[in-house]
């Protein structure tokens, strides 16, 4: 069985302010079990954008129905984009752990650039 990989096919995405950004991510396997999370930035100061497991993320919707048992598409949409949303977004697979899940694999990242609204 091949080891799970996290694929972010888009190196960069350009979105106009006020529009919706789609950030694509797929996993190549369902195993090991564990949640997907999206972050902006890397390292200890990274910002959690979406957690499959829990939390309230009103600007974020998933492209696919994550309640499908065979789902491997973890792409997200972020609504009402502003220049403050610019940055590199990482799709990260965690494997279950106790007491905390353990980071397992990260995608290569997608850089989101925001085009200002014409005045």
């Amino acid at each position: 069985e091949e080891e799970l990989q996290v694929i972010q096919p888009d190196k960069s995405v350009l979105v106009a302010a006020g529009e919706t950004a789609t950030l694509r991510c797929t996993a190549t396997s369902l195993i090991p079990v564990g949640p997907i999370q999206w972050f902006r930035g890397a390292g200890p100061g990274r910002e959690l954008i979406y957690n499959q497991k829990e939390g309230h993320f009103p600007r974020v919707t998933t492209v696919s129905d994550l309640t499908k048992r065979n789902n491997m598409d973890f792409s997200i949409r972020i609504g009402n984009i502003t220049p403050a949303d610019a940055g590199t977004y990482y799709c990260v697979k965690f494997r279950k752990g106790s007491p905390d899940d353990v980071e397992f694999k990260s995608g290569a990242g997608t850089e989101l650039s925001v085009r200002a609204k014409p005045s």
Epitope: I31, E54, K68, N70, K96
Partner: antibody, heavy 118, light 108 residues
Framework: DVQLVESGGGVVRPGESLRLSCAAS????????MSWVRQAPGKGLEWLAG????????YYIDSVKGRFTISRDNPKNSLYLQMSSLTAEDTAVYYC???????????WGLGTLVTVSS | SYELTQPPSVSVSPGQTARITCSGG??????YAWYQQKPGQAPVTVIH???KRPSDIPERFSGSSSGTTVTLTISGVQAEDEADYYC???????????FGGGTKLTVL
């Protein structure tokens, strides 16, 4: 408060069909996968079927594939289990259960009793 | 598929610690939960995701996992904890839910 209320149970003869319903309230039904679990008298729990939040994907234990059909009506906040070709072995209390993000169960209904007897 | 095995019965005195084990499944592909069922009642989830306790469940209930064995621990057992306890698993390889045979906890 999350509430799941099953209905539709009763006494049927072998070979007959029955449709169970589960009315959900207290949460956004269309956001959660759901399952049916049964318990024969004096026996343990047995998972039967699950359905994704949108209703497009269904999953069954081998022993009921082809005889049972799980479905849902999100606007009506309702889950269903259509059962056909019933036998005495299907006699049980049938529970609907809400799934967690990882397909375990966090809330259960009170159950509805199905008795298959000639 | 896989089977989950748990002891048929466990007895403990009030105030003591009860441990119920469940073995089977594969750690990397299976999530586990524990369900409490009292006579004539519906099951209640006391632990999910191996070790996560719902907010309305007393802190004396805890879950842990080691390899292919998961354990439900009830610290300071009370008379009201007497019930059947089922371990349940979800297998990400097969998309199937499975239950153990149940353990009857008797509070002496």
């Amino acid at each position: 408060d999350v509430q799941l209320v099953e209905s539709g149970g009763g006494v049927v003869r072998p070979g007959e069909s029955l449709r169970l319903s589960c009315a959900a309230s207290g949460f956004t039904f269309s956001s959660y996968a759901m399952s049916w679990v049964r318990q024969a008298p004096g026996k343990g729990l047995e998972w039967l079927a699950g359905i994704s939040a949108g209703g497009s994907d269904t999953y069954y234990i081998d022993s009921v594939k082809g005889r049972f059909t799980i479905s849902r009506d999100n606007p009506k906040n309702s889950l269903y289990l259509q059962m056909s070709s019933l036998t005495a072995e299907d006699t049980a209390v049938y529970y609907c259960a809400r799934e967690t993000w990882n397909h375990l169960f966090d809330y259960w209904g009170l159950g509805t009793l199905v008795t298959v007897s000639s | 598929s896989y089977e989950l095995t748990q002891p048929p019965s466990v007895s403990v005195s009030p105030g003591q610690t009860a441990r119920i084990t469940c073995s089977g499944g594969d750690y990397y592909s299976t999530y586990y939960a524990w369900y409490q069922q009292k006579p004539g009642q519906a099951p209640v989830t006391v632990i999910h995701s191996d070790d996560k306790r719902p907010s309305d469940i007393p802190e004396r209930f805890s879950g842990s996992s080691s390899g292919t064995t998961v354990t439900l621990t009830i610290s300071g057992v009370q008379a009201e904890d007497e019930a059947d306890y089922y371990c349940g698993g979800y297998d990400g390889r097969t998309y199937i839910n499975t239950f153990g045979g149940g353990t009857k906890l008797t509070v002496l």
